[in-house]
Interface confidence: low
């Protein structure tokens, strides 16, 4: 457990006294505070936040708050020419026009500067033609349309149903079909829970609500101008064309009121099954174009965003460690919001606040961690984790050798449920062993720990008794500490019920309707689930920084490598007859796992046994651990995707925010049944098998005795 | 309501300079973005500069580029614009504007619904 020795302190300053200073008051208030006006990246508001949080971090202790700034590519809305979607009759006249704005929530009518719908990064121009309804768009539903139902989408206007992948994906996959323009909409059946009312009224998406969001395909750039270097002052821009993941072709978010009226005329092809249906009162057909009355109407998109680079700022601060300040462990979340950010981002921005405040009381009486521990407000999150990974390149020579671990603080609450944790195999022990010691917030557990609650009502797929924890993927900050550096991370917040409610995300998600009174009043009236989010965050920060030996526990590593391993065998061998005629054995790969779990166990034992009070062996064992995690990266990256580098992680090529396991060997094998030439194919597929063992052997080496 | 009123035009030589002044009174904590418009005898009214209320975003129009420089003082709650180079097409009304909204690539793209001053003459001419 935490060690006190080492950083010459009272035993009063241990993890109990951090988790008992953070106080569910002092959450509520921070998130009042950072939720009264929309704080956009790039605009004056989210500067003046900027400054408010330098400011009172500096207050509570930290040793120094800069605040570090990029100049980067954003996207915004004309405000004197609106952005909508119109049916036109065929003497071109609109005969309806999707809403320009959402409706504001009670109290909010007179506040300025309320971004209204768009999609970000969307390029300028105004097609029109017949729409085709694509379901979500993903990989599998234009595979469907496509090879079974043979719709072509070439030219057309595809409309898609928010939910399941991340919007970026859909917008690729609807520019790979040839599609002409995006219109993407909120489906009740997705955003719209049963037996809840609308907002003001419950946590439901209104029918005026609309999902904002980038649409971009950056693969871990960060800002599409300067991919792999900071957007400095001296930096080199890439012209437009040449930038990095924009769409294509022109995208538009609504609301499922404006939904109903374009897909209430929806003709052609029947849904191919009961998977494409929604909730709406219309019939989902596919399409082409509206059925018979109507087959003279076309749809035409009207937009006029414009990309400007923009200056954002993320806040910096530093509570230096006492023995090893040249390690670190990161707390970092975003500050900027699409509106009012009440949960997206400022739930985890009060959180951050509130273990911030404590730490510094600890350090106000006398204590330090062992190691330093840097807190991040990002900024531009919302646009493609700009601030995080512009800053993440600026440091990265620091960072690949002194980062210890990275702990992720978006929103702290995405349902009032159970807990949902997302990290390396490391902090698996870590998650378990913290958890047991806090206490569960969750009604029917009082006086159980968090780790009984969350176990019951989230168990693990495999090893029973135990709660799941998932990979992670991206579509959050840790992307270029986890995916590019290879810096051990981790993120946790509370969830809904996944079992009971199948909608994707939570309705308000990126909606005006996201206020302080929206967690207020439905999610979290105690704030309790929040404390028990900044409890979790907070005490892994704090073990990370002050344990004597790293709590991380390769061991588990071993556990998931086999799992793996198998997964990824199994998809191949669904081609047994080509793996016969091309050769393809995945030998390499079972033996390296079995040399790191072997490796793996012999590095624990001595773990067990070595002379903690010996600093520089301690030290060396430490590195070890800290660098278990860097030598799973590999230098050239995935294929066509540089800055995702894990070899073990990478987020989907199919959707962002999924985690996939052996990435390069999975796309490697992903419908090659269609591939043109198989030989080639297969021999991509034994190559990625070739990078997965080296690179698997090489990680257990690290592991092995050094001399 | 804010207030504005500009001062510091004139008369002046091709390759001169001047510095033009907004002063901005009444609500100004409400004020996030200022800049410069100007309008020329017979022509629409055209974007000079913007900046923002902390001076991390600036804008200036391609044609005045390298030559005009916009700032400000916000304990004097005033704009500035300093014109170097002068040219004969520089002649026109230059216009303050003030805005409390402020998103995106068209955060200086002001519009009737914004404040405006009365504007100042800057004649250039030999």
């Known amino acids: 457990k935490s060690s006190n020795e080492a950083t010459n302190i009272t035993p009063k300053h241990n993890m109990k006294a951090f988790l008992d200073e953070l106080k569910a008051e002092n959450i509520k208030k921070f998130l009042y505070n950072f939720t009264q006006i929309p704080h956009l990246a790039g605009t004056e508001q989210n500067f003046q936040l900027a400054k408010q949080i330098q400011s009172q971090w500096k207050e509570f202790g930290l040793d120094s708050v800069e605040l570090a700034h990029y100049d980067v590519l954003l996207s915004y809305p004309n405000k004197t020419h609106p952005n909508y979607i119109s049916i036109i009759n065929e003497d071109g006249n609109e005969i309806f026009n999707t809403s320009l704005f959402e409706p504001p929530p009670p109290g909010y009518e007179n506040v300025s500067d309320i971004v209204p719908p768009f999609s970000a990064f969307s390029p300028q121009g105004m097609p029109e033609g017949d729409l085709v309804y694509v379901n979500y768009a993903r990989t599998e539903d234009f595979f469907k349309l496509e090879r079974d139902m043979k719709i072509n989408c070439s030219g057309k206007i595809v409309i898609a149903r928010y939910g399941k992948v991340f919007r970026g994906n859909k917008v690729k996959n609807a520019q790979l079909a040839g599609a002409k323009g995006v219109i993407l909409y909120s489906d009740p059946a997705d955003y719209f829970a049963p037996g809840v009312k609308s907002y003001p009224d419950g946590w439901n998406l209104p029918g005026g609500g609309v999902q904002r969001g980038n649409i971009l395909n950056l693969n871990g750039a960060g800002d599409p101008l300067t991919p792999g270097y900071p957007a400095n002052e001296y930096a080199y821009r890439r012209g437009i064309a040449e930038a990095v993941g924009l769409p294509s072709i022109p995208v538009h978010p609504i609301g499922y009121y404006d939904a109903q009226k374009l897909l209430e005329k929806m003709g052609g092809s029947a849904p191919p099954d009961s998977s494409w249906r929604g909730s709406l009162k219309v019939p989902y057909n596919v399409g082409p174009g509206f059925t018979g009355n109507f087959s003279t109407q076309k749809v035409k998109m009207h937009i006029h965003s414009t990309n400007e680079v923009t200056r954002i700022y993320n806040v910096i601060g530093t509570l230096r460690g006492a023995v090893e300040p040249d390690r670190y462990v990161i707390l970092g979340g975003h500050r900027d919001s699409w509106v009012f950010g009440g949960i997206d981002p400022q739930s985890g921005a009060a959180v951050v606040h509130e273990i911030v405040r404590s730490f510094g009381t600890l350090k106000k009486e006398g204590w330090r961690p062992r190691r330093t521990i840097l807190f991040a407000s990002w900024d531009a999150e919302e646009f493609g984790l700009l601030g995080s990974t512009e800053w993440a390149e600026e440091n990265s020579r620091l960072l690949q050798e002194r980062g210890v671990a990275y702990i992720n603080a978006d929103s702290s609450i995405e349902g009032n449920y159970t807990l949902r944790v997302d990290c390396t195999p490391l902090m698996y022990s870590l998650v378990h062993n913290l958890t047991k010691e806090l206490k569960s917030p969750d009604e029917g557990f009082e006086g159980k720990s968090l780790y009984e609650s969350w176990t019951k009502k989230s168990p693990s797929p495999e090893f029973s008794g135990m709660p799941r924890i998932s990979k992670l993927g991206s579509g959050n900050d840790f992307e270029v500490f986890f995916q590019r550096l290879g810096i051990a991370s981790g993120r946790a917040r509370y969830t809904k019920n996944w079992e009971t409610n199948k909608f994707s995300g939570y309705p308000l998600y990126h909606s005006v309707y996201e206020t302080y009174e929206l967690v207020e009043k439905f999610y979290d009236p105690m704030f309790k689930y929040h404390l028990t989010v900044a409890q979790v965050r907070g005490g892994m920060v704090f073990e990370l920084a002050n344990s004597i030996v790293l709590p991380f526990d390769c061991r588990d590593y071993a556990v998931v490598l086999r799992k793996y391993a198998d997964k990824i065998y199994s998809i191949s061998m669904k081609h047994p007859q080509e793996m016969k005629t091309y050769s393809v054995s995945f030998d390499s790969l079972f033996s390296a796992v079995k040399n790191f779990t072997e490796i793996a166990s012999k590095f624990s034992e001595r773990l067990q046994d070595f002379d903690k009070s010996n600093p520089i062996v301690l030290r060396m064992m430490n590195d070890q651990l800290m660098f278990l995690e860097r030598a799973f990266i590999d230098p050239l990256g995935l294929p066509d995707r540089p800055f995702y580098r894990h070899v073990i992680y990478a987020p989907s090529s199919h959707n962002k925010y999924a985690g996939e396991s052996f990435p390069g060997i999975y796309d490697a094998l992903f419908d090659i049944e269609s591939k043109v030439d198989p030989s080639k194919a297969w021999g991509e597929v034994k190559r990625q098998i070739y990078v997965a063992a080296f690179t698997v052997q090489a990680a257990a080496e690290t592991l092995s005795e050094v001399a | 309501q804010v207030q504005l009123v500009e001062s510091g035009g004139g008369v002046v030589q091709p390759g001169r300079s001047l510095r033009l002044s907004c002063a901005a009174s009444?609500?100004?904590?409400?004020?996030?973005?200022m800049g410069w418009y100007r309008q020329a005898p017979g022509k629409e009214r055209e974007f000079v500069a913007a900046?923002?209320?902390?001076?991390?975003?600036?804008k200036v129009s391609d044609s005045v580029k390298g030559r005009f420089t916009i700032s400000r003082d916000n304990s004097k709650n005033t704009l500035y614009l300093q014109m170097n180079s002068l040219r004969a097409e520089d002649t026109a009304v230059y216009y303050c504007?003030?805005?409390?909204?402020?998103?995106?690539?068209?955060?200086?793209?002001?519009?009737?619904?914004?404040?405006w001053g009365q504007g100042t003459q800057v004649t250039v001419s030999s």
């Open positions: 900046i923002s209320w902390s001076g991390s975003n600036r």
């Open positions: 504007a003030a805005s409390n909204k402020l998103y995106g690539r068209t955060w200086y793209d002001f519009n009737e619904s914004d404040y």
């Open positions: 009444g609500r100004t904590f409400g004020i996030y973005v």
